[in-house]
């Protein structure tokens, strides 16, 4: 039949299609953190560079006030790395004194705030005990996964101790998301 | 007006579109490293398997001489894992002797080289102090993020000490990139 | 020549195209594991939540009996994080007694099973020595990379010791895949 040559197979869908370059995307990089007030049982949120160096936001993905703002509903891949550094944790000192001890820890949480839910939703958590024996220690925690997000959702990165975050280089601590 | 029935909404873009299977992609896997000369303050680059086993390059993404070559401009997700292994680090030995010590460390850097820019750009860094107390240690560093790259850019993976890289299995140490 | 006006440039391909929202995708989250029999030299596989909370499967990507089932051939990004936690490893106790020791370890493997191939294929491995000095320890292993999969392939996550997996929170231990 006329015009059938291009009839799509069951695997091909022609609409609505979109140019990949038009999808919301962001890669944010670390900046020096200013201490901010946070609730007692809530980890503080990091703020980010969104336009200098390697950082960018595009296609209606905006950054404001610690948050990545999701401009359209869909499935997003979200990732972050936070590099921590510190002096010897108390843990090893106490251990040397012969007392067992709950180790210190470092934690990163990627959190979603949505207007359809009264509490933040923890999407991803990386948590690690730190019981280092050297005089200085440093290490990254990396997270990444895919989530279904709604237009208007807000994403942030929370950490257990903002003073331990290595803010010295944009390639060490970062946060990003892109619509799949 | 005639032909207006299919006017796209502001969220739908019809051109230029591309088949996803046509996008540049690569997954490279570890091979045994041959010691190579590198500049004193520059980490050595790893070389990779690009076609055997799990490794592949496709759609004009090519691998040559330690570099992934970017065939077209766009936003890419880039990732790498390097598994390190070694004997007890000096750190713990010195610590046992009662002297404080800067810890040993392991570092992975994904680096971009652009012809039009004199200096390589560090896109991603994972760095970790190693102060292990067992006789042998091993651990991975994983990195991944999205970057805007230009046609002709070259990507490589640098490590702090090539002799500590675990090259025994293709699933332990790898490097990849794909156009979003 | 007639009809040539719309010939795509070498960068633009118009068919077969597909709506991104139609691609197979899954994000699975941890559940409490029931001890299962496994072969002596084979790591046990985790089972997962596939529809509650943050977990989902869509577009013919199905989960059944520890496996993600790949519904169509193509390049997939596959990822997993497993958070482990345990008491002080024997390693440090033995070390204190003055005997050198092969450290304990934690390992995650993302494995592909193909009907046409007798042996499972290890796609990704994260393995880490554990020689902790605190009384309790916890830490994540993250993996993620791109692989060419065939319709009918099955993916699973294996771990070295199922009893050390932190199953308490859906954001700590997870497994996902999506068609690129």
């Amino acid at each position: 039949l006329k015009g059938q040559e291009f009839a799509p197979s069951h695997q091909q869908v022609y609409a609505p299609l979109r140019a990949d370059g038009d999808k919301p995307r962001a890669h944010l990089t670390v900046v020096r953190q200013t201490p901010t007030q946070h609730f007692k049982n809530q980890f503080p949120a990091l703020h980010w560079e969104h336009e200098l160096g390697l950082a960018f936001t595009k296609n209606r993905m905006n950054y404001t006030n610690k948050f990545l703002l999701i401009p359209e509903s869909g499935d997003y891949f979200i990732y972050s790395q936070v590099t921590f550094r510190g002096m010897t944790s108390e843990c090893s000192e106490i251990r040397q004194a012969g007392r067992p001890n709950k180790p210190d820890s470092i934690t990163v949480v990627i959190t979603k705030v949505t207007d359809s839910y009264p509490e933040p939703t923890q999407l991803l958590m990386g948590t690690k005990s730190v019981c280092e024996v050297g005089s200085n220690w440093f290490q990254p925690i990396y997270l990444g996964a895919m989530f279904s997000l709604q237009e208007g959702d807000k994403l942030m990165v929370n950490v257990s101790d903002i003073s331990l975050v290595d803010y010295t280089k944009e390639d060490k601590t970062f946060f990003g998301a892109f619509l799949l | 007006l005639k032909g207006q029935e299919f006017a796209p909404s502001h969220q739908q873009v019809y051109a230029p579109l591309r088949a996803d299977g046509d996008k540049p992609r690569a997954h490279l896997t570890v091979v045994r490293q041959t010691p190579t000369q590198h500049f004193k303050n520059q980490f050595p680059a790893l070389h990779w398997e690009h076609e055997l086993g799990l490794a592949f390059t496709k759609n004009r993404m090519n691998y040559t001489n330690k570099f992934l070559l970017i065939p077209e401009s766009g936003d890419y997700f880039i990732y790498s894992q390097v598994t390190f292994r070694g004997m007890t680090s000096e750190c713990s030995e010195i610590r046992q002797a009662g002297r404080p010590n800067k810890p040993d460390s392991i570092t992975v850097v994904i680096t971009k080289v652009t012809d039009s820019y004199p200096e390589p750009t560090q896109l991603l860094m994972g760095t970790k102090s190693v102060c292990e107390v067992g006789s042998n240690w091993f651990q991975p560093i994983y990195l991944g993020a999205m970057f805007s790259l230009q046609e002709g850019d070259k990507l490589m993976v640098n490590v702090s000490d090539i002799s500590l890289v675990d090259y025994t299995k293709e699933d332990k140490t790898f490097f990849g990139a794909f156009l979003l | 020549l007639k009809g040539q006006e719309f010939a795509p440039s070498h960068q633009q391909v118009y068919a077969p195209l597909r709506a991104d929202g139609d691609k197979p995708r899954a994000h699975l989250t941890v559940v409490r594991q029931t001890p299962t029999q496994h072969f002596k030299n084979q790591f046990p596989a985790l089972h997962w939540e596939h529809e509650l909370g943050l977990a989902f499967t869509k577009n013919r990507m199905n989960y059944t009996n520890k496996f993600l089932l790949i519904p169509e051939s193509g390049d997939y990004f596959i990822y997993s994080q497993v958070t482990f936690r345990g008491m002080t490893s024997e390693c440090s106790e033995i070390r204190q007694a003055g005997r050198p020791n092969k450290p304990d370890s934690i390992t995650v493997v993302i494995t592909k099973v193909t009907d046409s191939y007798p042996e499972p294929t290890q796609l990704l491995m994260g393995t880490k020595s554990v020689c902790e000095v605190g009384s309790n320890w916890f830490q994540p292993i993250y993996l993620g990379a791109m692989f060419s999969l065939q319709e009918g392939d099955k993916l699973m996550v294996n771990v070295s010791d199922i009893s050390l997996v932190d199953y308490t929170k859906e954001d700590k231990t997870f497994f996902g895949a999506f068609l690129l």
Epitope: Q37, N62, T64, N65, K66, F67, L69, V113, T114, D115, S116, Y117, P118, E119, P120, G152, K154 | - | -
Partner: antibody
Framework: QVQLQESGPGLVRPSQTLSLTCTVS????????MHWVRQRPGRGLEWMGR????????KYNPSLKSRVTITRDTSKNQVSLRLSSVTAADTAVYYC?????????WGQGSLVTVSS | DIQMTQSPSSLSASVGDRVTITCRAS?????MYWYQQKPGKAPKLLIY???NLASGVPSRFSGSGSGTDFTFTISSLQPEDIATYYC?????????FGQGTKVEIK
């Protein structure tokens, strides 16, 4: 301590614009979403719209969309509601509501009567 | 719009009784909310996400359900529970409330 306080004229003439302000304290407005909900006499609750104070992005009830505007002034910790072309049917108690990111919190409500 | 149909519109029960209110959404929703409103007061959130108890809310209040059918229960009615109870969905635009259930003591 979390507080949301609605303020504005209690009486508005028909066809005019109703304006209310919600002043918040005890939390960072940018970490949440701020809504306006109204309750007409003897009736149930009606959601009017919301603003994301971080971005200024708004969503409105389609039944009111042509008449309602919600804005924010983060420097003053305030969210404002404007409802144009009011009629007697807009007589209601208007509530400012916080949601998302923190437990729900409601203002005590502000009664606005539309009458000539 | 997602219509919320709440039943009954009113009920009378004795102190200590188990009270159940249902809410049906015209299409599936992920999260359901239940509010208590006493005369002259602002509504107070009791249940979020269908079954989670809001902070400071007594454990005699509970919620359950998924998709289109949701239930709110007071396991043992107390005098201070006299109020009107509303269900609400926060997902579709507009957000919509049920018409309310007035609970009285016999």
């Amino acid at each position: 301590q979390v507080q949301l306080q609605e303020s504005g004229p209690g009486l508005v003439r028909p066809s005019q614009t109703l304006s209310l302000t919600c002043t918040v304290s005890g939390f960072d407005m940018g970490d949440t979403y701020m809504h306006w909900v109204r309750q007409r006499p003897g009736r149930g609750l009606e959601w009017m719209g919301r603003i994301d104070p971080a971005s200024g992005h708004t969503k409105y009830n389609p039944s009111l969309k042509s008449r309602v505007t919600i804005t924010r002034d983060t420097s003053k910790n305030q969210v404002s509601l404007r409802l144009s072309s009011v009629t007697a049917a807009d007589t209601a108690v208007y509530y400012c509501v916080r949601s998302g990111g923190m437990p729900d919190a409601w203002g005590q409500g502000s009664l606005v009567t539309v009458s000539s | 719009d997602i219509q919320m149909t709440q039943s009954p519109s009113s009920l009378s029960a004795s102190v200590g009784d188990r009270v159940t209110i249902t809410c049906r959404a015209s299409q599936g929703v992920m999260y359901m909310y239940w509010y208590q409103q006493k005369p002259g007061k602002a509504p107070k959130l009791l249940i979020y996400g269908a079954s989670n108890l809001a902070s400071g809310v007594p454990s005699r209040f509970s919620g359950s359900g998924s998709g289109t059918d949701f239930t709110f229960t007071i396991s043992s009615l107390q005098p201070e529970d006299i109020a009107t109870y509303y269900c609400q969905q926060w997902e579709g635009n507009p957000r919509t409330f049920g018409q309310g259930t007035k609970v009285e003591i016999k």
